[in-house]
Structure formats: structure tokens, C-alpha cells
């Protein structure tokens, strides 16, 4: 539903996008994800902030919590207890890292319309959640875990050793949050709330990253984060399970680590409850090509958890690392022992497999030169998953249903033909037992969210269709978008090209490459966006291209694992190759080509600028990695191994931006970084700047004081305005 091309007579009423449009979020879209509370009911926050319950079966809806109650504690979020008696209200949200935040929590009793008084929760809380049944509460406060049997009861303290930056219970440390789980929590209720499993992370031996936070005080504060860089000491993780009915009886019981994992440094990667007395843990060697899935059972007689070797399943990669970005998680079937899991098949494509006894005997469920991406739900008779199979476009996502009750299993694409032009990139959200589901379409047209019957797949209603956005775009000259591929030396390079509204192939246009290019990423996706690059094409007449080269995801292991142990080589080569192909198309002004990227993209854009090809006139790196020795162990070592002489130190040294300082002499380089970046530390850009100064190479730079990796708030406006000026100057475009 992209507004169609208008006739010339109307064109004078149309206007181009402005930078202001982008910075104000004028053309942002809404999605609708139901907050499912049963097979047929969901909660949703209305426009006026009432919490409303919808019953699909009866077609009725009613308010369960008024905006007045929400406002009385300045609540920005809520959570209904499964027994429907209480709601927690979350306020004083204070962001920490990517997912983590602290907040104040109030418990509201729906039966009597009052807040629960007595034994109130401490503040601020790091994480809080209801049990899956009833209204028990688990929460983390000052790195320790507490349990309440009822909201008004006094808490039972489960752990006592929690200490800031040293021991984390029930919440991850920095590296587990960002690179492994990746969540703000590290505790998991069993299906009926009998047991609570949690992780303990010991960061005592991890080196600390320290940076200044300037604030408004006379003296800056120092932020200290235990942050393991490549090759450094890692967190030590242990998993415990406690009986929540009688927590004091035997206390937390540790779950044993598989022997083949415990023999050297390792990670815990995820925990999945199967039943109240069976749990599945996933472990990973520090050298991340071996993963072990371990199924453990509760021994009533010993009150311990037993993880027999016969229930250990090994997943190993011989050509790269285990999994995609993360090792996939199992989805258990109703027999509570067999499961479905996505991993590479013999042809090197990630597909769904059914594991009953051993991984060697796994039954492959999907197959083809495409990839299964996510398993949403397994019911008694159906398995719902997403893939990029349809019409062989890797940047699409459709939802499929495989009937597992019948033989042979039949496959149906639920979304492929629903709104074919408008919708080619879906995700889904399922109610209990998959009685109903919501489809959220992200594009390429204007996003739309719909509700469907889980048996018939029939559309029941539109939940959100972004009518206001559609109307607002009616008089906007949006750029055109194309998704195509280049075939180069047996490699397929998919690209997205964003073209000015009045694009004319016979004319010459400046080209901007937008790159990310990190391992297992994908930039060329069939999604809707009106963003900075849309403005650059619409108003400034630039052509923008995004290219998925080697190392990117969902096109098979050959492409994905090509960058294994060699980051910074093929990703850059493939961007350069694509630029040369674009020049051959005849409409690119080869004297006006730029590249820009953020984070991993900043690393790639820097290396591309310093490639010595003479292709790029200028470029921008925002918060770039400059040496893999400066980045997090979990991420970096997955793709690069260890920075030791007997492993991969040589390539760590060869792949730095600093090593190419001399090559920046003939390009215009804008380097940008936030000083309070907890993720890609300011150190990275500081070292690039130092190397450029030492090489007497001129460059431009901008820092954002006290800003993290996201450069949010007012910094965003300044950033995009600054980058726009830089590009317009580079391309000799008048202001």
C-alpha cells in the first residue's frame, strides 16, 4: 500500500520529504501486538490509556483498569496476574543497558479496587514477574532474588550473595544481556509455578571498562562496567532451581553442567522448561562451535536435578560457529521429550528438525535453498514457523503452518497471498493453544496488524491499519525502492536501491551506500520505512543502496560462514564489488559516491574508505568498532576465535581501522561517537583519531557527550543534521 505514482497534473501538489519530517517522526507507523491472557482473550492499552480486555469469542471488550489508576502512580506499563486478581503497575522507568532498566512497582488489587498496602515492594526493582499460574511474584532487588507467595505477603529472600558489579542473581551481567541471552532477566518459572530457575553470574575476575559521565556536576562520575573484551576473563555462570512452594525446605539446587562443557571455559545460553519437573538447558563452549542441549529431571527422592548423558544433545559446526546469531532454542512437543529445533542441514541451510532420541537421528521437517527463521508455536496438530522461501526473496518473511498430526505432513503458507503487494514481511503472535493469532506485517507497504482464527486462518479483524499514516503520505513524493540481486563470482549479492521520485536512468546521481554487514545480519528486507535515507533520496536526489554481502544471514552457511575468523575482509570487498556494478548501470556519478554505517557498519564503512580503491569520495562512521580486541568476548570470539598467538591474533591485528590510517588521506572522513557508549566504547574512535593524527591525516569528528551507542534524544537531531550537511558538501549539493 505504497501511495501509487501520481499523474503529472497532481505533481505540483506533492512535496518531497524534509529532514524535519524524519526528525519529528511524522511518518512513523504503529503495530498491534495483543497481550494474550488466554486462548481467546487479550489486553490492550487504549489510546486514552485505559487497560481494556478483549474476548474474541464473545466479541466483547471492557476496561479492567482505568487511566486514572494508571496516572495515580504515573504507570507506563502493567502486568496482569494469571489468576486475574492483581495488576502490577510499573513507573519511574530508568534505562540501564539495551534491555535492562529499573522501575518502581505497585500492586493493584482488582477485586477491591485498591493498591495492596503492607509489605510493599522495595525500590528500584531490577526485574519483576508473576508466576505462570496464580499470583506469586519473583523479583530482583540489588542483585538478589525474592519470592512472594501473594502480593501482600512478606518476601522470602532466595539469594544473599548479590553484589553490584560482582554477583548477579536472576539478571544478566552486561555481556550476557547484550550478546548471549539477550534479555533483561535470567530467571524462569516452571509451567505451573512449582519451581523457579535462575542464573548466577560471577563477574569478580572480569576486567572493568571505565568511562567518564560528565553530567552537570563539578566532577564527572566514572561509570564502571565489568566488560570482558576479546580474550579476557569471562563471567562464571551457575544455574539453580528452587521449589517455590517450600523455598526454605532444601533451598536452591544447582543444575550440573555437562562434563564435555565443564572441561574448559563455557557459557550458558538458554533455559526452557518442558514440564514442572523437566527442564532443558543449553550450554556452549567458549570456542563457540560446540553447543550442548541437556534435558534434566527432578529427582523427588533426592530433591535434586538429574541430567543424564543420554539426554545430552550435541550441536557442532565444522565450517563456522554454532547456530546463526544465537544457538536456536528448542520447542518441545506434547510428549515432553521430543522437540523441534532449527539448525543447519547437510546442504548448509538452516531448517527445522524434529529430535526424538539423538541429533544424528533427527528428522528434517523443512528443506530447500532457503531458511527457516523462527518456530512460533507447536500444537497437537500444527507447527507454525516463518521462512524466506516464498518466491526466493531472502529478505521476505512469511508464516507457514505444517500439519504434524497427519502423514505426510502438509505445508501451507498462511500469509503469502493475503496482501501480496503490501505485505511480504510478517511476524506473528499466538494465543494459548494457537486458538487465535495476530499477524503483524511490516511492509513493503504501510504496516498492518490483523487478527486470525488459529484453526481456519480466517481474518477476523484489522487491529491496526495506519490509516492516518496513509493519509499523511498522500501528498508526499516518496522515493522508489527496488530489491534485486547481483551475481558475482558464484556469490549472490542482494541489494535494495532507493531512488529519487523522478528518477531518470539517463541522468547521473550521487550514490550513498548504507552498510551494516555484521555476521548474521540482514539489511535488504522488504519492510516499510520513511527514514533519513528516504529523505536523502526524496529531497536531495541521492540514490541510496544497501547490500547484503558475505557474512549476512538467511541465505545458507556458505555465505554466512565465509567471514569466519576473517572479519573485515569479505564484507568490505562485497560492498566495493556492488559499487562497481552500480557504476556499470550507468546512472551513478562515479565522482560522488559515499558510504556510511553505524556500529559494525561504521567499521565496514571505515575499512571501505581506507580500501585504497578511490571509489569513495567521502564517508561517515558512527560509533564504529576499530579493533576486535576492543569489543566484547562473547560476540567477537564467536566469529574471530581468540586473540592469542596460537589462535587468531594475526588477523585481530590485521583487521584494525588504525592499521589503515594512511589510506584515509584521499577521502573525507567524518567520525562520530558517544562518550558514554557502554557497548562499542569511545576508545574505538579515540584510537582511530589518534592514528589519523599520528599519520597527519585530516578528518572531521563529532562526539556526543554522555550519549550511548544509540545517540538518542536531542543528539539524534544534531547527528542527522550534521551528517546531512557533510554529505551535501561532499556531493556539492546546495543548502
Amino acid at each position: 500500500l505504497r501511495p501509487s505514482r501520481v499523474h503529472n497534473s497532481e505533481e505540483n501538489t506533492m512535496r518531497a520529504l524534509t529532514l524535519k519530517d524524519i526528525l519529528n517522526g511524522t511518518f512513523s507507523y504503529k503495530t498491534f501486538f495483543p497481550n494474550w491472557i488466554s486462548g481467546q482473550e487479550y489486553l490492550h492499552q487504549s489510546a486514552d490509556n485505559n487497560i481494556v480486555l478483549y474476548n474474541i469469542e464473545t466479541g466483547q471488550s471492557y476496561t479492567i483498569l482505568s487511566n486514572r489508576t494508571m496516572k495515580s502512580v504515573n504507570a507506563s506499563n502493567y502486568g496482569l496476574s494469571p489468576d486475574r486478581q492483581f495488576v502490577y503497575l510499573e513507573s519511574d522507568y530508568s534505562k540501564l543497558w539495551r534491555y535492562s532498566y529499573t522501575a518502581t512497582y505497585y500492586i493493584y488489587d482488582l477485586s477491591n479496587g485498591e493498591f495492596v498496602r503492607g509489605n510493599e515492594l522495595p525500590r528500584p526493582i531490577q526485574y519483576l514477574c508473576w508466576s505462570p499460574v496464580g499470583s506469586k511474584l519473583a523479583y530482583v532487588y540489588q542483585n538478589n532474588i525474592y519470592l512472594k507467595q501473594r502480593p501482600g505477603d512478606p518476601p522470602f529472600q532466595i539469594t544473599f550473595n548479590g553484589r553490584e558489579n560482582k554477583i548477579f542473581n536472576g539478571i544478566p551481567d552486561w555481556v550476557y544481556e547484550e550478546e548471549m541471552l539477550p534479555t533483561k532477566y535470567a530467571l524462569w518459572w516452571s509451567p505451573n509455578g512449582k519451581f523457579l530457575a535462575y542464573a548466577e553470574f560471577n563477574d569478580k575476575d572480569i576486567p572493568v571498562i571505565a568511562y567518564s559521565y560528565y553530567g552537570d556536576e563539578q566532577y564527572p562520575r566514572t561509570i564502571n562496567i565489568p566488560y570482558p573484551k576479546a580474550g579476557a576473563k569471562n563471567p562464571v555462570v551457575r544455574i539453580f532451581i528452587i521449589d517455590t512452594t517450600y523455598p526454605a525446605y532444601v533451598g536452591p539446587q544447582e543444575v550440573p553442567v555437562p562434563a564435555m562443557i565443564a572441561s574448559s571455559d563455557y557459557y550458558f545460553s538458554w533455559l526452557t522448561w518442558v514440564t514442572d519437573e523437566r527442564v532443558c538447558l543449553q550450554w556452549l563452549k567458549r570456542v563457540q562451535n560446540v553447543s550442548v542441549l541437556s534435558i534434566c529431571d527432578f529427582r523427588e527422592d533426592w530433591q535434586t536435578w538429574d541430567c543424564p548423558k543420554t539426554q545430552e544433545h550435541i550441536e557442532e559446526s565444522r565450517t563456522g560457529w554454532a547456530g546463526g546469531f544465537f544457538v536456536s532454542r528448542p520447542v518441545f512437543s506434547y510428549d515432553a521429550i521430543s522437540y523441534y529445533k532449527i539448525f543447519s542441514d547437510k546442504d548448509g541451510y538452516k531448517h527445522i528438525h524434529y529430535i526424538k532420541d539423538t541429533v544424528e537421528n533427527a528428522i528434517q521437517i523443512t528443506s530447500g535453498k532457503w531458511e527457516a527463521i523462527n518456530i512460533f508455536r507447536v500444537t497437537q496438530d500444527s507447527l507454525f514457523y516463518s521462512s524466506n522461501e516464498f518466491e526466493e526473496y531472502p529478505g521476505r518473511r512469511n508464516i507457514y503452518r505444517i500439519s504434524i498430526g497427519s502423514y505426510p505432513p502438509s505445508k501451507k503458507c498462511v500469509t503469502c497471498h493475503l496482501r501480496k503487494e503490501r505485505c511480504q514481511y510478517y511476524t506473528a503472535s499466538f494465543s494459548d493453544y494457537a486458538k487465535y493469532y495476530a499477524l503483524v506485517c511490516y511492509g513493503p507497504g504501510i504496516p498492518i496488524s490483523t487478527l486470525h482464527d488459529g484453526r481456519t486462518d480466517q481474518e477476523i479483524k484489522i487491529l491496526e491499519e495506519n490509516k492516518e499514516l496513509e493519509n499523511a503520505l498522500k501528498n508526499i513524493q516518496l522515493p522508489k525502492e527496488e530489491i534485486k540481486k547481483l551475481e558475482v563470482d558464484e556469490i549472490t549479492l542482494w541489494y535494495k536501491m532507493i531512488l529519487p521520485p523522478q528518477f531518470d536512468r539517463s541522468k547521473k546521481y550521487p550514490l550513498l551506500i548504507q552498510v551494516y554487514g555484521g555476521p548474521c545480519s540482514q539489511s535488504v528486507r522488504s519492510v516499510f520505512a520513511v527514514n533519513w535515507i528516504s529523505y536523502l533520496a526524496s529531497k536531495e536526489g541521492m540514490v541510496i543502496a544497501l547490500v547484503d554481502g558475505r557474512g549476512t544471514a538467511f541465505q545458507g552457511d556458505k555465505l554466512l560462514y565465509a567471514v569466519y575468523r576473517k572479519l573485515g575482509v569479505y564484507e568490505v570487498e562485497d560492498q566495493i564489488t556492488a559499487v562497481r556494478k552500480f557504476i556499470e548501470m550507468g546512472f551513478i556519478d562515479e565522482k560522488r559516491i559515499a558510504i556510511w554505517g553505524w556500529s559494525y557498519g561504521g567499521y565496514v564503512s571505515s575499512l571501505a574508505l581506507a580500501s585504497g580503491t578511490g571509489l569513495f569520495k567521502c564517508g561517515i562512521a558512527v560509533a564504529p568498532v576499530s579493533s576486535w580486541e576492543y569489543y566484547a568476548s562473547v560476540y567477537t570470539e564467536r566469529f574471530m576465535g581468540l586473540p592469542t598467538k596460537d589462535d587468531n591474533l594475526e588477523h585481530y591485528k590485521n583487521s584494525t581501522v588504525m592499521a589503515r590510517a594512511e589510506y584515509f588521506r584521499n577521502v573525507d572522513y567524518l567520525l562520530i561517537h558517544g562518550t558514554a557508549d557502554d557497548n562499542v566504547h569511545f576508545q574505538n574512535s579515540a584510537q582511530i583519531a589518534k592514528a589519523l593524527v599520528n599519520a597527519q591525516v585530516d578528518f572531521q569528528a563529532m562526539w556526543y557527550s554522555d550519549q550511548n551507542h544509540g545517540l538518542s534524544g536531542l543528539s539524534t537531531n544534531h547527528l542527522y543534521t550534521h551528517m546531512t550537511h557533510f554529505l551535501k558538501q561532499c556531493f556539492s549539493l546546495s543548502d
Partner: nanobody, 115 residues
Framework: QVQLQESGGGLVRAGGSLRLSCAAS????????MGWYRQAPGKRREWVAT???????NYADSVKARFTISRDNAKNTVYLQMNSLKPEDTAVYYC?????????WGQGTQVTVSS
């Protein structure tokens, strides 16, 4: 405005039984998840029992095995069968959706259990 009319309360001896009814007004469908709640003198209103749209039931510990919640879709009515009543069950009993509809409580029906 949703109308929920409770009835069936009364005075009963300890160990006796009562059956409460809750009739939902025309527009409100009793197939919604429904609950019984009660308020004893000088105490806050508390939850007693729930029946979900698909018929699953849930009870407060204090009434488990003595009270039974059920519904008749044709009559748009929800029931609470109360057996082995105790003096501490004395309260005004209300029915509502589960979770309750904000600001929509009926008059309730008084249940008094004498010893």
C-alpha cells in the same frame, strides 16, 4: 453499562448449602471469563472463584472443594454452588467478569452463615 444481577443469598446454618445465581444483562455475554467475589463485614472485597470462557475453573484456597462455579450459556447466567458453609463465609457475594469490569459492581447478595 453492564448489568449483573446476583441472587440466591440468605441465612443458612453452618454445614448447609446455597446456590447463588448471576444473570448478565442482554448485551453482556456470560461466556466471558466470570468470577464470584465476596466482602465480609469490615474487610476488603476478595476473589472467590473464576470460570474461563473455555470452562476451566479456579478457586480461592479457602473455598476449594466446597464451592463450585458453573455457567448456563443459554440463560446467560453464572452460578456458585456453596456447600459445607462456615460462619467465615458470611459476606456479601458479588459476581463480575474476571478480571472485574472497572467500576461495575452490582448490589451483591447477602449470605449469612450462623453457627
Amino acid at each position: 453499562q453492564v448489568q449483573l444481577q446476583e441472587s440466591g443469598g440468605g441465612l443458612v446454618r453452618a454445614g448447609g448449602s446455597l446456590r447463588l445465581s448471576c444473570a448478565a444483562s442482554g448485551t453482556f455475554d456470560s461466556r466471558n471469563a466470570m468470577g464470584w467475589y465476596r466482602q465480609a463485614p469490615g474487610k476488603r472485597r476478595e476473589w472467590v472463584a473464576t470460570i474461563t470462557t473455555d470452562g476451566r475453573t479456579n478457586y480461592a484456597d479457602s473455598v476449594k472443594a466446597r464451592f463450585t462455579i458453573s455457567r448456563d450459556n443459554a440463560k446467560n447466567t453464572v452460578y456458585l454452588q456453596m456447600n459445607s458453609l462456615k460462619p467465615e463465609d458470611t459476606a456479601v457475594y458479588y459476581c463480575n467478569a474476571a478480571p472485574p469490569i472497572f467500576g461495575s459492581w452490582g448490589q451483591g447478595t447477602q449470605v449469612t452463615v450462623s453457627s
